[in-house]
């Protein structure tokens, strides 16, 4: 065509893929007739017509855009649909009259590519690796034209660097006439990359400009051998027996190499190896004073058999010992004095404190109880508490009973109970005193004793409610070297007008499941009659 | 094309050590990695070792101390041994390729039966 | 180590039927996933990698879908060659591999 070499730069349009691409013929009426045009792709520098308008109608030759053009702004501008990446490529239109002319459109064609997809090395890299290794790869689907990749690590951007960063990429043309852009990061690793944050980002162009996704970011396994080996026990802080221990050894190499406890043995100074659970942790549970001792840890590295030592840790397991108290079982006449003495033996200092075993109140702080004209009422239990300070919960604990002599002590002197005849009736009578007492009845029963501690005893009796028992009542009797006692119980047969609700009497009802002349499991329950304490 | 082909011995004693050669064919060692999958008899696959394109050797944990692979890129050759053989390791034996710009194995030898009996 | 739970672990169909078969990880494994076809006597055959990516020279009827824990594959027409035990792979962190899922002639 004559002066094609001076033709100008064609126009650019710039369209994404699937939407409509508006083709604007640009000759002016001078150049020709927009009423008669002829539209022409080209592609490899072979025209094609395409679309013909003439009296300012159009239409559409045979051929792959047959169904997709069609005339806008009054026969100026040819429509594109549906445009596909295989569209780019030149349009020309040309005007017939008064002479040919010709104008060239460009066509620009774009497509965002899906979010990239990254995939880490799922076996991991070591960081000892001869040449780089993959460490992750890319990929971006169906962008066009060929998106660019930046691999980033901790938010930097990597360069290829000789035998210590590589990427490759490589793209697939799919059916679609779109790109699938495949990228691999190799790097050599070092053990700080074990967190290093690795991601790929996709630069693209839209007819907007310019644009860019990111891949997830990915962390890669990162091996590397140990240098250091540790132990940590938990709890931390100061241990005492009965408590779980754990006994963790550590590494800083990945994977975690084999480990094995050992604890010295003072007498052989020999380290004996200790047996862990499946993770390499020794339990001490619970723990014991003798756990205490030197422990140390060695890590076996299984494809070198190398093997590293921890600094020792010496482990101690706070105790307090058994609690002697003396004397063990002191006894002494009213009025006289004693002296309580408390020892144990413990890894930290100790502190002691007496208490009375029946209201816990402390008597005295110091190993040392000293008491003084001793009353009847000071025989009982006393309690020596040996306890650490610095450490809570570790203390033990020592009884001691004191008894102090002297004759039968009843727990009531005379009680009324009320009855019904022919009932079987569980009575019962308590006293103390050292030594400690017995107890008999004045009337024929079924009897049992029980001790309720070394010095006071407890009666019970069953018998049946006879007219004769209600006359004489019922008497119990203790007796020691010391002297003897007695406590009566008065039988009183219950009638409707011993039990008015606004009665003022406090005595009780002896209840009984049983009927006249049956001597079944029945029982009677007594409540005490208000009077003054008899103490015998 | 790519192929890939295991071969080694069809029977093995008991504390016998088994030793299997993939030669491939179509690609370089140096460009894909290779893997040894087993599939015991109407069970399912197993991974069991690979080495890189790189050359660094990755094993399963389950068989750690036993396992040992190797290359020799000249030959075109991955050498899988695997000692101390028992008869639950009577299985069928794969080596795989991994795919370039992936970590899935896109081509398969036809596998080799190996069976562990006295 | 990540588990994979296939289900159902086998199942019968008949040609032209759409089939789903199940893949649960133990753990996020995002979408390191690959399915394999296996015929008796033969080795496995990639289908979809990356839970959703057809493998070139795979049918348009085999889809991946899902991402994290779990995945599905499906076959949306079946045909008599597609008859054969198909297993799930992730490779997020090591290899491990599915049950299996045997597909059978109704």
């Known amino acids: 065509v004559p002066g094609e070499a001076e033709q100008p730069a064609p126009e650019l349009v710039e369209v994404e893929v699937g939407s409509t691409a508006l083709l604007k013929c640009g000759l002016s009426q001078s150049q020709g007739n927009l009423s008669h045009v002829d539209w022409f792709s080209v592609h490899k520098e072979k025209r094609t017509l395409i679309f013909r308008v003439r009296q300012g109608q159009g239409q559409s030759e045979p051929g792959e855009y047959e169904q997709r053009l069609s005339l806008q702004d009054r026969g100026a501008t040819l429509a594109l649909t549906q445009v596909t990446p295989q569209d780019e490529r030149i349009f020309l239109c040309q005007g017939k009259r008064p002479r040919s002319q010709e104008y060239r459109i460009q066509l620009r064609v774009y497509k965002a590519p899906e979010e990239p997809n990254i995939q880490v090395n799922p076996l991991g890299i070591p960081v000892n690796s001869k040449e780089p290794e993959e460490v992750a790869t890319c990929v971006g689907r169906n962008g066009y034209p060929i998106p660019q990749v930046i691999w980033y690590k901790n938010g930097r951007p990597l360069k290829e660097e000789k035998n210590r960063v590589h990427i490759q990429s490589s793209q697939t043309v799919e059916s679609s006439g779109l790109y699938t852009l495949q990228s691999i990061l190799k790097a050599q690793l070092v053990k700080e990359d074990k967190d290093a944050q690795f991601y790929c980002e996709l630069n693209y162009r839209l007819p907007s400009g310019n644009h860019m996704k990111e891949s997830r970011e990915v962390t890669v396994p990162v091996f590397y051998p140990t240098e250091k080996v540790w132990l940590e026990v938990e709890p931390v802080g100061m241990l005492k027996e009965g408590d779980r221990v754990e006994i963790r050894c550590l590494a800083d190499g990945n994977p975690p190499p084999h480990f094995s406890i050992s604890k010295g043995n003072p007498s052989t100074r020999e380290a004996e190896e200790e047996t862990t659970n499946d993770n390499g942790v020794l339990v001490l549970e619970p723990a014991r004073k003798e756990h205490s001792g030197r422990y140390e840890c060695q890590a076996w590295n299984l494809d070198t058999m190398i093997s590293l030592l921890s600094e020792p840790q010496e482990l101690l397991v706070n105790y307090v010992s058994d609690v002697r108290v003396s004397p063990a079982a002191p006894e002494r006449q009213e009025g006289s004095s004693l002296t309580l003495t408390c020892e144990a033996e413990s890894s930290q200092d100790l502190e002691f404190q007496w208490l009375r075993e029946e209201t816990d109140q402390v008597l005295e702080r110091g190993p040392v109880l000293q008491l003084h004209d001793l009353k009847r009422e000071a025989g009982g239990g006393y309690r020596c508490v040996a306890s650490v300070p610095s450490i809570p919960g570790l203390n033990r604990t020592q009884l001691v009973k004191l008894a102090i002599f002297g004759p039968p002590w009843m727990a009531f002197k005379e009680r009324k109970v009320w009855v019904k005849e022919n009932m079987v009736l569980n009575l019962s009578c308590e006293a103390s005193g050292h030594p400690r007492p017995t107890i008999s009845w004045n009337v024929n029963g079924t009897a049992s004793e029980g001790d309720q501690d070394p010095q006071r005893v407890l009666s019970t009796l069953n018998v049946l409610v006879t007219p004769e028992l209600l006359e004489t009542g019922v008497e119990c009797t203790a007796s020691n070297d010391l002297g003897k006692n007695t406590s009566i119980l008065f039988l009183e047969l219950v009638n409707l007008t011993t039990l008015t609700p606004d009665s003022n009497t406090t005595t009780g009802l002896s209840t009984s499941t049983a009927s006249p002349h049956t001597r079944a499991n029945s029982t009677s329950t007594e409540r005490k009659l208000p009077e003054p304490e008899s103490r015998g | 094309q790519v192929t890939l082909k295991e071969s080694g011995p069809v029977l093995v004693k008991p504390t016998e050590t088994l030793t299997l050669t993939c030669t491939v064919s179509?690609?370089?060692?140096?460009?894909?990695?290779v893997s040894w999958v087993r599939q015991p008899p109407g069970k399912a696959l197993e991974w069991i070792a690979a080495?890189?394109?790189?050359?660094?050797?990755y094993y399963n944990s389950a068989f750690k101390s036993r396992l040992t692979i190797s290359r020799d890129t000249s030959k075109s050759q991955v050498v899988l041994t695997m000692t101390n053989m028992d008869p639950v390791d009577t299985a069928t034996y794969y080596c795989?390729?991994?795919?370039?710009?992936?970590?899935?194995?896109?081509?398969w030898g036809q596998g080799t039966l190996v069976t562990v009996s006295s | 180590d990540i588990q994979m739970t296939q289900s159902p672990s086998s199942l019968s169909a008949s040609v032209g039927d759409r089939v789903t078969i199940n893949c649960k990880a133990s753990?996020?494994?995002?979408?390191?996933l690959a399915w394999y076809q296996q015929k008796p006597g033969k080795a496995p055959k990639v289908l979809i990698f990356?839970?959703?990516s057809l493998q070139t020279g795979i049918p348009s009827r085999f889809s991946g879908s899902g991402s994290g824990t779990d995945f599905t594959l499906t076959i949306s027409s079946l045909q008599p060659e597609d008859f054969a035990t198909y297993y799930c792979?992730?490779?997020?962190?090591?290899?491990?591999f599915g049950q299996g899922t045997k597909l059978e002639i109704k």
């Open positions: 795989a390729r991994r795919y370039g710009y992936g970590w899935y194995f896109d081509f």
């Open positions: 179509g690609f370089s060692l140096t460009s894909n990695g």
């Open positions: 080495i890189s394109s790189g050359g660094t050797t």
């Open positions: 753990q996020n494994i995002y979408n390191s």
């Open positions: 990356n839970a959703n």
């Open positions: 792979q992730q490779f997020y962190s090591g290899y491990t």
